[in-house]
Amino acid sequence: HTAAQDNCTCPTNKMTVCSPDGPGGRCQCRALGSGVAVDCSTLTSKCLLLKARMSAPKNARTLVRPNEHALVDNDGLYDPDCDPEGRFKARQCNQTSVCWCVNSVGVRRTDKGDLSLRCDELVRTHHILIDLRHRPTAGAFNHSDLDAELRRLFRERYRLHPKFVAAVHYEQPTIQIELRQNTSQKAAGDVDIGDAAYYFERDVKGESLFQGRGGLDLRVRGEPLQVERTLIYYLDEIPPKFSMKRLT
């Protein structure tokens, strides 16, 4: 695959170790933390990226209202278990034998339990709502220009086809990007919306996962779009199962 042949690096994932030990002396890159070989011609799965992050040295009205089943990642970072394809395993446990079920983007979707907790399947997150607040500008951005620029960004930077960008909503200073991708829509080779959203989130925070690629420089008709807050909501194909006490 297309790890940069000349200097053997992974352009789409800097959290890798690369060496020319692939077939025919080709550059092969493995994710930190898991040692799994990654395809450097596309995005690395969020599960492998989180695992790599945990193993790395630590550094100091037109808007959509998410429905009651929308999940926000309030639990923060954890060291996930990934399957051989790099997907999250449906059940995640910590070192103290506390377990919980996650969705395809690794966000907890049940109460925490013990080792007896069963997670029958990995439930797919089919709808992601990225809620952004941009820094003040001289005037509002033109909505259609903003829409076109964000769709182009997801295609060019994250390899996500615009057909998966369901909508871009704008009510200054709030921008909402809706990503939708049902299991039936996702063809072989299509980037997962969860992975694209994670790369975007890290880019917006100034923590780009790309190797040797400039940071995110988003402009709408030449005007810089600087994000000062991000909130991401995840909606699953099957609603989450939390007890009532969590909701009070």
Epitope: P11, S41, R152, R155, E156, K163, A187, F210
Partner: antibody, heavy 120, light 107 residues
Framework: EVKLDESGGGLVKPGGSLKLSCAAS????????MSWVRQTPEKRLEWVAT????????YYPDSVKGRFTISRDNAKNTLYLQMSSLKSEDTAMYYC?????????????WGQGTSVTVSS | EIQMTQSPASLSASVGETVTITCRAS??????LAWYQQKQGKSPQLLVY???TLAEGVPSRFSGSGSGTHFSLKINSLQPEDFGSYYC?????????FGAGTKLELK
Amino acid sequence: EVKLDESGGGLVKPGGSLKLSCAASGFTFSSYTMSWVRQTPEKRLEWVATINSDGIYTYYPDSVKGRFTISRDNAKNTLYLQMSSLKSEDTAMYYCTRVHYYGYDAMDYWGQGTSVTVSS
Amino acid sequence: EIQMTQSPASLSASVGETVTITCRASENIYSYLAWYQQKQGKSPQLLVYSAKTLAEGVPSRFSGSGSGTHFSLKINSLQPEDFGSYYCQHHYGIPLTFGAGTKLELK
């Protein structure tokens, strides 16, 4: 004025290799996704390869995957198509195209084409 | 792979007439469709993308319509320079595929 000038076509034997080049001018080359499209002698258009603006992502149809490699040099404003293990069915006029900035995979400028003939 | 079927394969018309070329996709491609014109001995030129958006510099007598699986390109008041071949192409995802073309000839 947008200009795309292909070169490198010619007659090659089956199993042989050829490298096509496309010199781009009149626009900011490094901002655009680029593609190669070919036109068969029967006048059918076939998409051959696409590369995104900074060259990280490449796309191919199954018919050429593993045999053709698209690449670009943004410093030289040049697009390339390395073709190997050529077959008679690769005989065509090869066009270098610019992908519309917001039109995703619609191609808004085409070069004049370079002819490739694969024959023994 | 999405198959694109164009009709008719050829048609004859006179200057000033209005003609319509149709394109059918084998599955839903929403509005991800482009139309190209190719004159004899020349390279194709983009006319329409996203089913109905006219490319820069394309005369307003050309119009695209449709979504899902059925699309059409309409040319009002044909001009002498409009004769040639027309191709549709989906841009809904990889692989990109084209229709076989429609040859528009002077009657």
